[in-house]
């Protein structure tokens, strides 16, 4: 398991315009866990990173992920309700130069090494769908969310807004 060194453990405003022409409005270093309090961990295996969903032992340190938050304008012609709206998008980086990516063909979530500007597959629309939990919707595939399947992260299609509170797409962010 690994974390990110040298990043402040609180949110900070940034002045960095290098990512797709927009700067993150803030960044936040946090551990990611499921609704049922299993930890999301990252391990280097055979020169590639694997993502696991597991119960940690009592004093085992949680892996941290750097979440970068971006504000995105959503044009009224896409929003369907005739008004321009704003939404929050995030990228998630568990270690330097690696970001979570949505692989829509394989319905999988993968860690890819890439340079900025990041591809759209690395961006997720942030949802607060349940008290103090968040969900991550693929920018490239609306209605598809990061979720938990067989102790791994996977992409899960959510058919209706009533299913947005389903536990397997809910995550908790914690600084500890």
């Amino acid at each position: 398991a690994f974390g990110i060194s040298g990043v402040q453990k609180y949110t900070r405003a940034l002045h960095d315009s290098s990512i797709t022409g927009i700067s993150p409005i803030t960044e936040y270093l946090a551990s990611l866990s499921t609704y049922n309090d299993q930890s999301i961990t990252f391990a280097l295996e055979d020169e590639s990173y694997e993502i696991y969903v597991e119960d940690l032992k009592k004093d085992e340190k949680k892996d941290k992920v750097l979440l970068s938050y971006y504000e995105s304008q959503h044009p009224s012609n896409e929003s369907g309700d005739g008004v321009d709206g704003k939404m929050l998008m995030v990228t998630l980086s568990p270690t330097k130069d690696f970001w979570l990516h949505a692989n829509n063909k394989e319905h999988s979530v993968e860690l890819h090494k890439c340079e900025k500007p990041l591809p759209d597959q690395a961006f997720f629309v942030l949802h607060n769908m349940h008290s103090n939990c968040v969900s991550f919707e693929c920018k490239t595939d609306p209605g598809v969310f990061i979720g938990v399947k067989d102790n791994h992260l996977a992409l899960i299609k959510v058919d209706s807004s009533e299913n947005l509170c389903t536990e397997n797409i809910l995550f908790k962010l914690s600084e500890t």
Epitope: T26, S79, G85, L88, L126, M129, C165
Partner: antibody, heavy 121, light 106 residues
Amino acid sequence: QVQLKESGPGLVAPSHSLSITCNVSGFSLSKYGVHWIRQIPGRGLDWLGVLRAGGSTGYNSALMSRLSISKDSSKSQVFLKMNDLRTDDTAVYFCVRDHYYYSSYGGFVYWGQGTLVTVSA
Amino acid sequence: DIQMTQSPASQSASLGESVTITCLASQTIGAWLAWYRQQPGKSPQLLIYAATRLADGVPSRFSGSGSGTEFSFKINNLQAEDFVSYYCQQLDSSPYTFGGGTRLEM
């Protein structure tokens, strides 16, 4: 154009219940959360609760047992119901909309004009 | 629940001056803090969100700073319409609590 408008009973007797309707237009309740906030005359703001875009609710811990929030999406209405009213529930009640789609992190740009509810015998 | 402690409760200032209001959160809230202005008999107006972002149409004499647990809000070059009440609110976690407010007096 985004609008929220509260309509309430004005006067409620102690121990009775309060129902306020928030009529919204210019946006979809499936995309934005709607919150209820109240302000006792001459005092500060109290957050009461939220109905999130996905349908889940969150409430003020101290008032949770007396509050419920629901919606009728087909009529673009959000409802606040509060039971067992006391005189110190006298306040202006506001409904407000999230700034961001799907998320409350951005605060509240759009507010209703508020409806004054007086609890008195 | 997260407690928000806003200070001062009231402050006197003159036209053209600058004032600063602070808000302390009882636990870390990242950058998820908003500042509102409220004129008497009116609904509050969002001025700053995400701790530092100016809401649409808000003059640049308003600014916000801070992260974690300590936040501040500054008004430069005070105008007559600024002598009203101001509130902070944390939006990191439900319940989304407000500070007690600051009344700005001339």
